[in-house]
Amino acid sequence: LQDPCSNCPAGTFCDNNRNQICSPCPPNSFSSAGGQRTCDICRQCKGVFRTRKECSSTSNAECDCTPGFHCLGAGCSMCEQDCKQGQELTKKGCKDCCFGTFNDQKRGICRPWTNCSLDGKSVLVNGTKERDVVCGPSPADLSPGASSVTPPAPAREPGHSPQ
């Protein structure tokens, strides 16, 4: 025998109290698949969470984070604070990058400036807490006997830190 509940579509539940009639999900609840015996309570986006998508009878609400925070976890289960450029998030909040390190994003960690001398280059632009150094031509390229000056290397595009 076929289960009568299997005929209940998404957005309804199979109401055992009413001879297994398909009843609409009550307000603030949803069922995303057919044949459900209960509807799930809609997620509420409160506090630092804000509503990205309203709950409907067939799908849960989706949250994101208010400005100054970013999502972490499956389905934005957590909101982690942003820091300013030139800072990193520590266990005790946002802290300025130490001298010799930088962070050009609102999240991630402070990373060491590029060591231009490892590539035989000179520092063209000093680094800051927010920006990496820019390496210029090697000292040999700048010597009077050099036939031509190589153009400065473009600033290294740092990869994103793992979050």
């Epitope: 990193e88 998030l89 520590t90 266990k91 005790k92 960690i109 793992p162």
Partner: nanobody, 124 residues
């Protein structure tokens, strides 16, 4: 697959106690430091406590120092948080998190796997 599953949350009166557990699977538990982090309804994530892979080093946020105790049982792949003298401001969803290194401290924020959380409500 790396998984963390918290339990032990609930409703407790101010001044009461709770013990949270976090069961880990999918990685060599003793090789990694672990942390507890919480999110209160109106706030972002707040670090609570961390413990090294061996359990020999522990660190606490000032807000919980002297009231909360972090511990681990590497033979059971389980992390614990004993919470005493609970206050209304401790109300939050508590997450356990795996860190990316064996050692830990109270500065570097390098959690890379999170549990789904357990809710602690402190209210009379």
């Amino acid at each position: 697959e790396v998984q963390l599953l918290e339990s032990g949350g609930g409703l407790v009166q101010p001044g009461g106690s709770l013990r949270l557990s976090c069961e880990a699977s999918g990685f060599t538990f003793s090789s990694y430091a672990m942390s507890w982090v919480r999110q209160a309804p109106e706030k972002g994530l707040e670090w609570v406590s961390s413990i090294s892979g061996s359990g020999g080093s522990t660190f606490y946020a000032d807000s919980v120092k002297g009231r909360f105790t972090i511990s681990r049982d590497n033979s059971k792949n389980t992390l614990y948080l004993q919470m005493n003298s609970l206050r209304a401001e401790d109300t939050a969803v508590y997450y356990c998190a795996k860190e990316g290194t064996t050692e830990t401290d109270d500065y570097h924020y390098n959690m890379d796997v999170w549990g789904q959380g357990t809710t602690v409500t402190v209210s009379s």
